[in-house]
Interface confidence: low
């Protein structure tokens, strides 16, 4: 197999890598590399990530921390978890809103925007599935309402004239 192999580090523990002249111990999560070690198997100089930056993993080479992401207010996102030295901001949607992915194959890192959940009650419909990671799913019309076009219309209360089948209990019509 071609190519050069990095020299093996014969140090106790496995958190050592060749940095410059020597095998050095890496920096823990939340710290960046200020300077490599000055002796074999020594400790690198590591500094804590400044405010609003983070590094999620232990590392041997990052000389600066990553900037924390800002949640996209234009997309109605909110911070579910604030950024720390070891973790990026976790953006999501506030209660009553759900995530609408902006790409077809959605993964956790995909861009998204927040949509308000459908209020089935305001549409006079049953709630079939509550809004969480997907929109509310509304069912058929609530008692006292019937399907008309795309909406639910209040049942007539008079026994005169026609009474839609779903309104039998309201306007007294029976089959």
């Amino acid at each position: 197999q071609g190519g050069t192999r990095s020299p093996r580090c014969d140090c106790a523990g496995d958190f050592h890598k060749k940095i410059g002249l020597f095998c050095c111990r890496g920096c823990p999560a939340g710290h960046y590399l200020k300077a490599p070690c000055t002796e074999p198997c020594g400790n690198s100089t590591c500094l804590v990530c400044p405010q609003d930056t983070f590094l999620a993993w232990e590392n041997h080479h990052n000389s600066e921390c990553a900037r924390c992401q800002a949640c996209d207010e234009q997309a109605s996102q909110v911070a579910l978890e604030n950024c720390s030295a070891v973790a990026d901001t976790r953006c999501g949607c506030k209660p009553g809103w759900f995530v609408e992915c902006q790409v077809s194959q959605c993964v956790s890192s995909s861009p998204f925007y927040c949509q308000p959940c459908l209020d089935c009650g305001a549409l006079h419909r049953h709630t079939r599935l509550l809004c969480s990671r997907r929109d509310t799913d509304c069912g058929t019309c609530l008692p006292g309402f019937y399907e008309h076009g795309d909406g639910c219309v209040s049942c007539p209360t008079s026994t005169l004239g026609s009474c839609p089948e779903r309104c039998a209990a309201v306007c007294g019509w029976r089959q």
Partner: antibody
Framework: EVQLVESGGGLSQPGNSLQLSCEAS????????LNWVRQAPGKGLEWVAY????????SYADAVRGRFTISRDNAKNSLFLQMNNLKSEDTAMYYC??????????????WGQGTQVTVSS | QPVLTQSPSASASLSGSVKLTCTLS???????IVWYQQRPDKAPKYVMY???????SKGDGIPDRFSGSSSGAHRYLSISNVQSEDDATYFC?????????????FGSGTKVTVL
């Protein structure tokens, strides 16, 4: 007695179109959401498309989105599936299936006997 | 897309019993599924819906020999006193919404052979 009877299947060439129909009887058609589900020979069930009781909500599987169109005529107790730009992988038995009127749950409680679609050159 | 996993086959002796499993992907462990029976060259038939708490409701004409239960992400269909007409493929299915898109996903089916 609830009945769903599909028709319109047959042999078609790739790129051609077919329209499937499903005629319903024995229940109040306009109260129910409806679905098309297909089954390739010797394979499992694959959901194709959904339409709500008043056509206000329509959804498609990724494999057919942009090529198939689901519609219904509540006055005629009929459900339709317009299939355009057919591909060989659309070869399957196509079933229409009824979603029960409000149960608070998802189910497909009655199925038609199916209509066979074969796409081959 | 949600994932429902079923083993491909199971066998049961006449008058014996068999228990079929449908496993949901972990994030859906509280979702309701539906069991369907499909006899050879026939349309699927609704057997029951089955909630995460084990409560279930059977379709018209489904005998008492069929029952459902749940444990975590697993949904079970049990058939006791198995009869020859139970020889069929059993699918689990689940309706779901993702954003505004409604859909169904099905397991690959378990073929039950009555010996």
């Amino acid at each position: 007695e609830v009945q769903l009877v599909e028709s319109g299947g047959g042999l078609s060439q790739p790129g051609n179109s077919l329209q499937l129909s499903c005629e319903a009887s024995g229940f109040t058609f306009s109260n129910h959401d409806l679905n098309w589900v297909r089954q390739a020979p010797g394979k499992g069930l694959e959901w194709v498309a959904y339409i709500s009781s008043a056509s206000g909500l329509i959804s498609y599987a990724d494999a057919v989105r942009g090529r198939f169109t689901i519609s219904r005529d509540n006055a005629k107790n009929s459900l339709f599936l317009q299939m355009n730009n057919l591909k060989s992988e659309d070869t399957a038995m196509y079933y229409c299936a009824r979603d029960p009127a409000y149960t608070g749950l998802y189910a497909l409680d009655f199925w038609g006997q199916g209509t066979q679609v074969t796409v081959s050159s | 897309q949600p994932v429902l996993t079923q083993s491909p086959s199971a066998s049961a002796s006449l008058s014996g019993s068999v228990k079929l499993t449908c496993t949901l992907s972990s994030e859906l462990s509280n979702f309701t599924i539906v069991w369907y029976q499909q006899r050879p060259d026939k349309a699927p038939k609704y057997v029951m819906y089955l909630k995460s708490d084990g409560s279930h409701s059977k379709g018209d004409g489904i005998p008492d020999r069929f029952s459902g239960s749940s444990s975590g992400a697993h949904r079970y269909l049990s058939i006791s006193n198995v009869q020859s007409e139970d020889d069929a493929t059993y699918f689990c299915g689940m309706g779901y919404t993702l954003a505004n898109q409604y859909g169904w996903v099905f397991g690959s089916g378990t073929k039950v052979t009555v010996l």
